[in-house]
Amino acid sequence: GDMLIQKTIKKEVVLEEGTIAFKNWVKTGTEIYRQFWIFDVQNPQEVMMNSSNIQVKQRGPYTYRVRFLAKENITQDPKDNTVSFLQPNGAIFEPSLSVGTEADNFTVLNLAVAAASHIYPNPFVQVVLNSLINKSKSSMFQVRTLRELLWGYTDPFLSLVPYPVSTRVGMFYPYNNTADGVYKVFNGKDSISKVAIIDTYKGKRNLSYWESYCDMINGTDAASFPPFVEKSQVLQFFSSDICRSIYAVFESDVNLKGIPVYRFVLPSKAFASPVQNPDNHCFCTEKIISKNCTSYGVLDISKCKEGKPVYISLPHFLYASPDVSETIDGLNPNEEEHRTYLDIEPITGFTLQFAKRLQVNLLVKPSNKIQVLKRLKRNYIVPILWLNETGTIGDEKAKMFRSQVTGKIN
């Protein structure tokens, strides 16, 4: 009866050669797609000259198949019951699931100009940078193809910098032929309640980006959780995309292809300001942009991005404070479309369906030494793109799951 099922589950969710979990863990059987919507700026000149609100129009989806590569350098460590691995990155464009091609053009913030003015606050340096920005005919905004914006281009301004800096720029540059990790996770052999929980990331138990407990690497990578998930649980997971650990809470029961699953969502509380949720105090790293830590819904991850002023939010600034989006026109936050959820089969702890949604923004500030930023009268957190990464268990896999797991229990 129940004891036999528990025993079977405990055996099959262990991350070692020969188990169901291991086979699917090494290389996911689920097709995962990442859809991008790019925020095309409609009034670049007005913004640069008059510090007007930025009018954006989202264009998308542009879809890529991702996470199709098997984990690499898988190494079991019997001493501490862990398994380490690298998660290789790869993206293949899917024209049939996209509104256009990778050659489509977009007017977006000039990433290098915005970043350089932030990274080099020294006024003497800014004078030099200004001359190079002007010499390269760069401006506050630029026109780039989708491929360039996402995967990288040689920036004309950075090409004139006399220092050995990387001249390649892109929202996800470098991506193809790179890997995330090394992750070291518990394999569950000694304690099934720890299976898939991250022990270390890049050799450390903390990130060195945040103060206090915010810096901890908590939970799993969200692809699975320890088995026998309860609705009352708060599921912790780490996302390298947002450079932090976060959590999800139970929202509803869902039937997914005949499999009963629990839908866990990222609550708005996770994005709240320290005023509303004191637990978030250590995610507030500066006082000016955050209006003394009263702003909410955006996360400054510059420390994780070599000082580049990157801010992560939910799409269309969902759950963000009004001051964040007051400089941007054309946004329509919508909970159903823009929140993140995980559909978890509670017996195995496997995530059978998910939608990870996030928006990447860049801060641009006025600078009286940089001509193209001189006329700005306020700071802007500029949305560049938002993404929807989804995966759903395939019909064949679902059938197998029904017969081997949920069928046996019912």
């Epitope: 990274i119 606050p121 020294n122 006399p162 070599e306 000082g307």
Partner: antibody
Framework: DVQLQESGPELVKPGASVKISCKAS????????MHWVKQSHGKSLEWIGY????????GYNQKFKSKATLTVDNSSSTAYMELRSLTSEDSAVYYC????????????WGQGTTLTVSS | DVVMTQTPLSLPVSLGDQASISCRSS???????????LHWYLQKPGQSPKLLIY???NRFSGVPDRFSGSGSGTDFTLKISRVEAEDLGVYYC?????????FGGGTKLEIK
């Protein structure tokens, strides 16, 4: 006024590592690149590399890439250079030097740290 | 790497004389951004180097106007119009236009 105070002389054995420090004062440490320069006895100068304290970004002379590691501690306005797998060829005076502000010149220099590698 | 060749190796002068040091690079020092990052340093005995001239001809603050720099492309010159006792030491040219940045071998200015 701007000052760069380097750590004292070092006598180390071949194969060992050493970490030289350079404490900056009189300016905003995170605003300027810090460079390191080697001067072997009676010889010319060689640029090793630089670090930008604001974000820890580095640039190296390829010749020294596997020899030197540059780091900073912004809380104490101190730059460090670690030299590893030392040989007698590494015996030299090592200078830290502040960047003049993105025009690739060094406007202030430390007094130098003498490193002697000998068994 | 760009090789910086300084001549002469040693320059004996009398106080009050004019001195001229040449520096030649193995390739043009005009950076793709149009600037020429050729600088001159003086290292007095037992001291750290000090910046004299940056970007070919700009005197660094506090440097007397008897020091002047000129040149372009691959040929550069440092001139001292009237040598004083405090000018003695080793002069180095330096290029920051191509990584790795390199120094010349030095020219020792000494009393005749």
């Amino acid at each position: 006024d701007v000052q760069l105070q380097e750590s004292g002389p070092e006598l180390v054995k071949p194969g060992a590592s050493v970490k030289i420090s350079c404490k900056a004062s009189g300016y905003t440490f995170t605003d300027y690149n810090m460079h390191w320069v080697k001067q072997s006895h009676g010889k010319s100068l060689e640029w090793i590399g630089y670090i930008y304290p604001y974000n820890g970004g580095t640039g190296y002379n390829q010749k020294f890439k596997s020899k030197a590691t540059l780091t900073v501690d912004n809380s104490s306005s101190t730059a460090y250079m670690e030299l590893r797998s030392l040989t007698s060829e590494d015996s030299a005076v090592y200078y830290c030097a502040r960047d003049g502000g993105y025009d690739v010149y060094f406007d202030y220099w430390g007094q130098g740290t003498t490193l002697t590698v000998s068994s | 790497d760009v090789v910086m060749t300084q001549t002469p190796l040693s320059l004996p002068v009398s106080l009050g004389d004019q001195a001229s040091i040449s520096c030649r690079s193995s390739q043009s020092l005009v950076h793709s951004n149009g600037n020429t990052y050729l600088h001159w340093y003086l290292q007095k005995p037992g001291q750290s180097p000090k910046l004299l001239i940056y970007k070919v001809s700009n005197r660094f603050s506090g440097v007397p106007d008897r020091f002047s720099g000129s040149g372009s492309g691959t040929d550069f010159t440092l001139k001292i119009s009237r040598v004083e006792a405090e000018d003695l030491g080793v002069y180095y040219c330096f290029q920051g236009s191509h990584v790795p940045w390199t120094f010349g071998g030095g020219t020792k200015l000494e009393i005749k």
